[in-house]
């Protein structure tokens, strides 16, 4: 069944990074508009992006209510200009999205090195804690707040004068590494959720930061 001259949406795809979550679909509408519904397995259908001519819908405000829930969305197609018509007894065509569990599936955004500080032969590297749109008691939570110890960071570091990389890992946002005195080092970090077994277990690498630039501070003791 379907409504005259409307085409069901297809290629429904979740795009999610650090819990900012958008549902995308095709086709670009010609004489039709869309409405999205989202539900959890224990919840019910909630309509969003009413009668939109866009082919995306930001569902972040729904999924952040419980990022460990599994969500299902569907996109309804309506003929443009007739969306409020009650004359038709036909149900508008719709397509279901794949199921989406934010905690397991949101991509990890590119991390940023907040600072590094050298004290003698040790360097403390701090990763910036990203804020998310997930809330608890009206307070926005950081990525670390949400994932806790499930989230680790891998630090790649190397002497500016060579290409041999070393790695370190932490389940906080700080590294304390040993360096050679008098050498400049470069750093890059990557966010990782080791428990994930899918392609989204790692973020892209952060921008490289090197000693001798403004982010760092060096103190010889």
């Amino acid at each position: 069944s379907g409504t005259t001259n409307t085409v069901a949406a297809y290629n429904l795809t979740w795009k999610s990074t650090n819990f900012k979550t958008i549902l995308e679909w095709e086709p670009k509408p010609i004489n039709q508009v869309y409405t999205v519904q989202i539900s959890t397995k224990s919840g019910d259908w909630k309509s969003k992006c009413f009668y939109t001519a866009d082919t995306e819908c930001d569902l972040t405000d729904e999924i952040v209510k419980d990022v460990k829930q599994t969500y299902l969305a569907r996109v309804f197609s309506y003929p443009a200009g007739h969306v409020e018509s009650t004359g038709s007894t036909e149900e508008p065509p719709y397509e279901n999205s794949p199921e989406f569990t934010p905690y397991l599936e949101t991509n990890l955004g590119q991390p940023t090195i907040q600072s590094f500080e050298q004290v003698g032969t040790k360097v403390n590297v701090t990763v910036q804690d990203e804020w998310t749109l997930v809330r608890r008691n009206d307070t926005f939570l950081s990525l670390r707040d949400v994932f806790g110890k499930d989230l680790i960071y891998t630090l790649y570091y190397w002497k500016s004068s060579s290409s041999g990389k070393k790695t370190a890992k932490t389940n906080t946002n700080e590294f304390l590494i040993d360096v050679d005195k008098g050498e400049n080092y470069c750093f890059s970090v990557q966010a990782v959720i080791p428990s994930r077994r899918t392609a989204n277990r790692k973020s892209t690498d952060s921008p490289v930061e090197c000693m001798g630039h403004e982010k760092g501070e060096s103190r010889e003791i």
């Epitope: 069944s1 539900s39 397995k41 224990s42 919840g43 019910d44 259908w45 909630k46 209510k65 036909e90 149900e91």
Partner: antibody, heavy 118, light 107 residues
């Protein structure tokens, strides 16, 4: 265990309003939607609408749009259904029922008989 | 709105009988079809959800299935406590709608 306890029977005159309460216990109130279903004497079941207690989002059957108002008080885990402009055909047992998935009513209140009579 | 047509509207059966009730939806509803039992003066009780899943605490003599657009509730061996009215209900599309009911009476 999940319990939904509704307020007592009501007798109303045509044109009046009625407000039925439904006190929930045994689960986290804001996690599950609350629906309202009515049943006229000797008749079938009719879905009226639903509310998400986490944000008070509502959805109503078109037949009741503008006449029914669903609300919640999360501090007391209580849901309310108010029906206005009552007419004799609104005489029915009104049930609150907790959702357990899209359009799935796993737990029901005991029902509240609303009689509309002049 | 989607309409469910239940058949039969009533039936007489004996204890131990196999009973089948059918519900046909006017439009596609995927597997979002639920069955409820109601006894006089009581609230409905969920028996089967998502076409064939047994709700917790419901005896295994109740089962649900689908063939094409026909959804079926089967009671394999009718017990005295099963004499009641049974409703199907679609949970796929708003507004949610119920069948008109099937009354199972003692023969």
């Amino acid at each position: 265990q999940v319990q939904l306890v509704q307020s007592g029977a009501e007798v109303k005159k045509p044109g009046a309003s009625v407000k039925v309460s439904c006190k929930a216990s045994g689960y986290t109130f804001t996690t599950y939607w609350m629906h309202w279903v009515r049943q006229a004497p000797g008749q079938g079941l009719e879905w009226m609408g639903m509310i998400d207690p986490s944000d008070s989002y509502t959805s109503y059957a078109q037949k009741f749009q503008g006449r029914v108002t669903l609300t919640v008080d999360t501090s007391t885990s209580t849901a309310y259904m108010e029906l206005s402009s009552l007419r004799s055909e609104d005489t029915a047992v009104y049930y609150c029922t907790r959702g357990s998935g899209p359009g799935l009513f796993a737990y029901w209140g005991q029902g509240t008989l609303v009689t509309v009579s002049s | 709105d989607i309409q469910e047509t239940q058949s039969p509207s009533s039936l007489s059966a004996s204890v131990g009988d196999r009973v089948t009730i059918t519900c046909r939806a006017s439009q596609g509803i995927s597997n979002y079809l639920n069955w409820y039992q109601q006894k006089p003066g009581k609230a409905p009780k969920l028996l089967i959800y998502h076409t064939s899943r047994l709700h917790s605490g419901v005896p295994s003599r109740f089962s649900g299935s689908v063939s094409g657009t026909d959804f079926t509730l089967t009671i394999s061996s009718l017990q005295p406590e099963d004499f009641a009215t049974y409703f199907c209900q679609q949970g796929n599309t708003l507004p949610y709608t119920f069948g008109q009911g099937t009354k199972v009476e003692i023969k």
